[in-house]
């Protein structure tokens, strides 16, 4: 067991040295571990086949140390791994796009609070039993078309706090499992009305606190088990453009939140959901 | 500042269920997550589970698994914690508590709720 | 239980006193310590965090520290209002869950 850490067999050979200090990945981690715990350290880098010889790995947490590089083959060997946390690592900025390949029984990946600018092309290739992603609160500025294409078993996807102004047609392709989708405190002005096509699984929908003026309802429309979304937050231009979105808002039977006019002046502040129709003209 | 508001005493037959509520006021539930823990008269506290509302996810005590249910309402700033097939031993005070941060595992419960007297008799 | 503690402890005004916590390497040798007061009658309080960290509006003469699998709470210049349940608290990854100490009840003599 290396110095700094503690280590024990039940229920799981676990590996824990958080909080030490550490400034790189220590050597001399049992082969046997199942979960390495290195959170709150200082380590900057994860070298290629840090974790190699430890086969049985199931979970793995890196958080809240200073990653600044991870290589591509940090993670290979590890077809057992399930769970894999490296958020809080604010200078990580971009991950390789074949970092997680191989990571075929990984369920939930924490990318959080990393800095990220950007998802790599087939960054989540190959990821098919992902079922929680984490990507909140990061620098992205853009959804690449089929960055998700993989994750068909996913059932929450955490987006909240980043810099995307828009969602493109693509963005959210293969996503037939997904419960929860959380967009909110982003940038998004535009929504592709085929945005959300793959998504007639979803139940929780946060739209709230971005940049929306109007959101097209065949954009919702696929939208079959949808129970909870919020809209809120957002400068919604409240003219005849709005009313297939306010038509839509009297029909759904889900908890909406209110969606409070921002134009015209004299609307300014009303909830959409309680105008009538005829409060919606001029174009 | 963070409040939490918990539903009144209950009094319930054995082999029944009970849900207690937990209003927060003062805060969103998107920053923290919530957790209960009981006490039963002159004894210790017992941690059950907990919930981070804005992941939609749940954790709970493996004593209590598969007869808790801890769930929660964001458009109400609302947990809640459901207990099944309640025998006399559950007889407690039922408290929930706001965890600073979102990781239950480096929990620190800042905020509690006044409790809830829940009394199983026949 | 899974962390001990001891059933009391007690000590006159003015005084300094200790109460320990005895977990295992899941646990305290793992994870942060925390510890909280239960004044009689009321809701139990976030006294320490992470191991030695004070909320605010706690007063400086708690204070907490770990070493290995144990830990400690310390209370200096003990005063009566300080009569309460005090608790210690960790996360234990064996168990996957929360665990609490078996509480000390502190008199104020």
């Known amino acids: 067991c290396p110095g700094a850490c503690v280590c024990y067999n039940e229920p799981k050979v676990t590996t824990s040295c958080p909080q030490q200090g550490l400034q790189a990945v220590p050597v001399g981690i049992p082969a046997a571990s199942q979960r390495i715990f290195l959170h709150g350290n200082r380590i900057s880098h994860v070298p290629a086949a840090s974790f190699r010889a430890c086969r049985n790995l199931t979970i793995l947490w890196l958080h809240s140390n200073v990653l600044a590089r991870i290589d591509a083959a940090a993670f290979t060997g590890l077809a057992l791994l399930e769970q894999l946390d490296l958020s809080d690592n604010a200078q990580l900025r971009s991950v390789d796009p074949a970092t997680f390949h191989g990571l075929g029984r990984l369920h939930t990946l924490h990318l959080d609070r990393c800095g990220l600018q950007e998802l790599g092309p087939g960054l989540f290739r190959g990821l098919a039993a992902l079922q929680y992603l984490y990507l909140q609160d990061n620098a992205l500025q853009a959804l690449p078309d089929d960055t998700f294409r993989d994750l068909g078993n996913l059932t929450h996807l955490f987006l909240h706090g980043n810099r995307i102004s828009s969602v493109p047609e693509r963005a959210f392709r293969g996503l037939h499992s997904l419960d929860r989708l959380l967009l909110h405190q982003n940038r998004v002005a535009h929504v592709h009305p085929h945005a959300f096509r793959d998504l007639g699984r979803l139940m929780t929908l946060y739209l709230f606190a971005n940049n929306l003026s109007a959101l097209p309802t065949e954009a919702l429309a696929p939208l079959r088990a949808l129970q909870y979304l919020r809209l809120n937050d957002n400068p919604w231009v409240c003219d005849c453009r709005a009313r297939p979105l306010w038509a839509w808002l009297q029909k759904f039977r889900g908890s909406s939140s209110e969606v409070p006019c921002s134009l015209p002046q004299r609307l300014a502040g009303r909830d959409l959901k309680r105008l009538a129709a005829n409060d919606l003209q001029g174009c | 500042e963070v409040q939490l508001v918990q539903s009144g005493a209950e009094v319930k037959k054995p082999g029944s269920s009970v849900k207690v509520s937990c209003k927060a006021s003062?805060?969103?539930?998107?920053?923290?997550?919530i957790t209960w823990v009981r006490q039963a008269p002159g004894q210790g506290l017992e941690w059950m589970g907990g919930?981070?509302?804005?992941?939609?996810?749940?954790n709970y005590a493996q004593k209590f698994q598969g007869r808790v249910t801890i769930t929660a309402d964001e458009s109400t700033n609302t947990a809640y914690m459901k207990l099944s097939s309640l025998r006399s031993e559950d007889t407690a005070v039922y408290y929930c508590?706001?965890?600073?941060?979102?990781?239950?595992?480096?929990?620190?419960?800042?905020?509690w709720g006044q409790g809830t007297m829940v009394t199983v008799s026949s | 239980y899974v962390l001990t503690q001891p059933p009391s402890a007690s000590g006159t005004p003015g005084q300094r006193v200790t109460i320990s916590c005895s977990g295992s390497?899941?646990?305290?040798?793992?994870?942060?310590v925390n510890w909280y007061q239960q004044l009689p009658g009321t809701a139990p309080k976030l006294l320490i965090y992470?191991?030695?960290q004070r909320p605010s509006g706690v007063p400086d003469r708690f204070s907490g520290s770990k070493s290995g699998t144990s830990a400690s709470l310390a209370i200096s210049g003990l005063q009566s209002e300080d009569e309460a349940d005090y608790y210690c608290?960790?996360?234990?990854?064996?168990?996957?869950?929360?665990?609490f100490g078996t509480g000390t009840k502190l008199t104020v003599l």
């Open positions: 390497s899941s646990n305290i040798g793992s994870n942060t």
């Open positions: 508590a706001r965890v600073v941060g979102l990781r239950l595992r480096d929990a620190a419960f800042d905020a």
């Open positions: 919930i981070i509302p804005i992941y939609g996810t749940a």
């Open positions: 608290a960790a996360w234990d990854d064996s168990l996957n869950g929360y665990v």
């Open positions: 992470s191991n030695n």
């Open positions: 003062g805060d969103t539930f998107s920053s923290y997550a």
